[in-house]
Interface confidence: medium
């Protein structure tokens, strides 16, 4: 799986979309998990409704919401009030039995609020980022990870 980068502005909302084949994944619940280290497990953040037919209902866990358009084949995750610690590698997953298929690997980048003059030195940029021109709520820029670009910062 290629990694898609989604960029959001600190303090605002970021929407991540994960398209999938609605026929292939028919009847399956979905989940959003955070990758713990490059080879570590993916820790569940939030999953769609326990009853698959109600997957369109938005479910929240803290500041993260998930909703699934099962007919159109799009899983949408909303990260509200984006913070620097939200930056990192995530996965959209399709659940079947005790297993999970990766629908998309997502790298979330948190950009400094251009209207906030506080020091942005603690904001993490895993690689060369595209400029963020539109700071509208629920808006994001996404791109595929560049070849050779590392989704995790080097560990000392």
């Amino acid at each position: 799986h290629n990694t898609t980068v989604f960029q959001g502005v600190a303090g605002q909302s970021l929407q991540v979309s994960c398209p999938y084949d609605s026929m292939k994944h028919w009847g399956r619940r979905k989940a959003w998990c955070r990758q713990l280290g490059e080879k570590g497990p993916c820790q569940r953040v939030v999953s769609t409704h326990n009853l698959w037919l109600l997957s369109f209902l938005r479910r929240w866990n803290g500041s993260t919401a998930i909703t699934d358009d099962t007919l159109g084949g799009t899983l949408t995750i909303t990260l509200r009030n984006l913070q620097p610690h939200d930056a990192g590698l995530y996965q959209c997953q399709s659940l079947h039995g005790s297993e999970a298929d990766t629908l998309r690997k997502v790298l979330v980048e948190v950009l400094a609020d251009p209207l906030d003059h506080r020091d942005a030195g603690d904001l993490w940029f895993p690689g060369e980022s595209e400029s963020f021109e539109d700071a509208h709520v629920e808006h994001s820029i996404s791109r595929s990870l560049l070849e050779g670009e590392i989704p995790f910062p080097p560990t000392s």
């Epitope: 084949d21 026929m23 292939k24 619940r29 079947h96």
Partner: antibody, heavy 123, light 112 residues
Framework: QVQLVQSGAEVKKPGSSVKVSCKAS????????MNWVRQAPGQGLEWMGR????????NYAQKFQGRVTITADESTSTAYMELSSLRSEDTAVYYC????????????????WGQGTLVTVSS | DVVMTQTPLSLSVTPGQPASISCRSS???????????LHWYLQKPGQSPQLLIY???NRFSGVPDRFSGSGSGTDFTLKISRVEAEDVGVYYC?????????FGQGTKLEIK
Amino acid sequence: QVQLVQSGAEVKKPGSSVKVSCKASGYAFSSSWMNWVRQAPGQGLEWMGRIYPGDGDTNYAQKFQGRVTITADESTSTAYMELSSLRSEDTAVYYCARLLRNQPGESYAMDYWGQGTLVTVSS
Amino acid sequence: DVVMTQTPLSLSVTPGQPASISCRSSQSLVHSNWYTYLHWYLQKPGQSPQLLIYKVSNRFSGVPDRFSGSGSGTDFTLKISRVEAEDVGVYYCSQSTRVPYTFGQGTKLEIK
């Protein structure tokens, strides 16, 4: 109507490979999982693996991992099962079977089966 | 892998009488979407298997209403209310909740 037509019987030598085909018609081939199940003489049913023709995604039973390859050709709506390093215990009838979908939810049951292909492994 | 165990392995029934086959799984067959993917197949002599019941209790199209399925979790039952001559063959329970899909050993139904 849905039809799955399999290739004819094969006689193979131990150590060789066999490739069985399954031509599908009457439904959207690309968007339904296709399974392969085998049945040794006088024995029960054994699931080998499956493929989703739309993107080539496959799952195999551990027992056959490394020896079986399931492929699909969307242009001809045909699924293939190739089994290598054949041994006498692989003598069996091999079936392709489509996974049924019903709403709401996936039933994930095999509703249509091919007629079966007898593969005999003998020296 | 999920192990499916059927009982009895063979059954001899007088036409018109009921028959019952039990199937037990080694772990729960409730999927993450809350459906239970337990199915029943019949393989008549010299034929390919055919689907009878899907998702525990749903009769497949064309299957007579004398066939019924029930159960939950790990214990399931197939019942034939009145056995007919055409019902002879081997009955298999199968799960598709978890990959790899697995089948029971089969129950052979004969007519007395």
